[in-house]
């Protein structure tokens, strides 16, 4: 597993460095999670041919994965810091059930899958501290999540492989869009 944020060689080599700001900590946390996703994607792509699947085939999958849209205030046109922050936190909370699904999907990267899940929880906490309008953040319903998880786990092998690939790809894209927006704040 990658070294957790704040423990990399750069920090060790620069003891005079100021403590990380809230923005720097969030930035590092996202980059750390992206590292983990990269490792998980490697295993997924080595195991199946899902990574070569066409976008059309992937689009047929009816997963309701969070995605950034212009209305969310995270794009440069119509950028709105608070609206965007709410979208990022809400999206990450919605991804949690899918990250739970990933937990039993990896053999050699089991630890990595757990690290991605736990690091995402920490990221949500960091972001919630940054947000002013916590009331606007809707938390997914646990009952709905539980039935979704059961449904996903009941799929056949091919669909489970496809779901795993789609979750990783979409989560990576969502984090990249979030990283870009957060750096503009």
């Amino acid at each position: 597993a990658p070294v957790p944020p704040g423990e990399d060689s750069k920090d060790v080599a620069a003891p005079h460095r100021q403590p990380l700001t809230s923005s720097e900590r969030i930035d590092k946390q996202i980059r750390y999670i992206l590292d983990g996703i990269s490792a998980l994607r490697k295993e997924t792509c080595n195991k199946s041919n899902m990574c070569e699947s066409s976008k059309e085939a992937l689009a047929e999958n009816n997963l309701n994965l969070p995605k950034m849209a212009e209305k969310d205030g995270c794009f440069q046109s119509g950028f709105n810091e608070e609206t965007c922050l709410v979208k990022i936190i809400t999206g990450l909370l919605e991804f949690e059930v899918y990250l739970e699904y990933l937990q039993n999907r990896f053999e050699s990267s089991e630890e990595q899958a757990r690290a991605v899940q736990m690091s995402t929880k920490v990221l949500i906490q960091f972001l919630q501290k940054k947000a002013k309008n916590l009331d606007a953040i809707t938390t997914p319903d646990p009952t709905t999540n539980a039935s979704l998880l059961t449904k996903l786990q009941a799929q056949n092998q091919w669909l489970q492989d496809m779901t795993t690939h789609l979750i990783l790809r979409s989560f990576k894209e969502f984090l990249q869009s979030s990283l870009r927006a957060l750096r503009q704040m």
Epitope: K10, E24, D27, R31, L34, S38, K55, M68, F75, Q76, S77, R169, K172, E173, Q176, S177, L179, R180, R183, Q184
Partner: antibody, heavy 122, light 107 residues
């Protein structure tokens, strides 16, 4: 192999609109983390960033030129188009398109086109 | 906007020498800084991304370091092909900004 190539007029008259096309191969502008930007360089001067478009169609412009610039992409044709209105002799420069593509969005231009020299003169 | 300032604006050195050039950002950009090399009549070429990571294919005699507002590019054992202009780039947030460049002459 990743390649980019700029095309467009070499000479434009003041007040006219410049349209430049960046045709690329070896990557897809629908892959997350991928973007294409435009950078210009007046003769003997430094590089100046103009515009950038991401895989998800998020667009960024240089604040000083924003009112004159439009960037668009055609993913199926592997092309990015930059238009710049109301051209002036001070806009004479070599115009480059360049790719940025990495998981962590380091905004680093790892591959550049050869550049096209645009002269603004009546 | 984040301003990028490079120093010196020009320098000359002999083949085999080592040189260091610097780049300052007007505010903290963490490690979001890139270095490019441009030979006359050619397009720029990425040397270093994220302050200290060498781009694939770039010789190990190049070394980038720094964080927050102060960054350096060091070239050890200069070669004739190292001549040209070096630009640093703010890669933290848009608008992206470049430094004015450091012109390196190899004697």
């Amino acid at each position: 192999q990743v390649t980019l190539k700029e095309s467009g007029p070499t000479l434009v008259k003041p007040t006219q609109t410049l349209t430049l096309t960046c045709s690329f191969s070896g990557f897809s502008l629908s892959t997350s983390g991928v973007g294409v930007g435009w950078v210009r360089q007046p003769p003997g001067k430094a590089l100046e960033w103009l515009a950038f478009i991401w895989w998800d169609d998020d667009k960024y412009y240089s604040p000083s030129l924003e009112s004159r610039l439009t960037i668009t992409k055609d993913t199926s044709k592997n092309q990015v188009v930059l238009t710049m209105t109301n051209m002036d002799p001070v806009d004479t420069a070599t115009y480059y398109c360049a790719r940025s593509a990495d998981d962590y969005l380091y905004y680093s231009f790892d591959t550049w086109g050869q550049g096209t020299l645009v002269t603004v003169s009546s | 906007d984040i301003q990028m300032t490079q120093s010196p604006s020009s320098l000359s050195a002999f083949v085999g020498d080592g040189v260091t050039m610097t780049c300052w950002a007007s505010q903290s950009i963490n490690d979001y800084l890139n270095w490019y090399h441009q030979r006359p009549g050619e397009a720029p070429e990425l040397l270093v991304f994220a302050a200290s990571n060498l781009q694939i294919g770039v010789p190990s005699r190049f070394r980038g370091s720094g964080s927050e507002t102060y960054f350096t590019l060091t070239i050890n054992s200069l070669q004739p092909e190292d001549s040209g202009t070096y630009f640093c780039q703010n890669a933290h947030s848009f608008p992206l900004t470049f430094g004015g460049g450091t012109k390196l002459e190899i004697k």
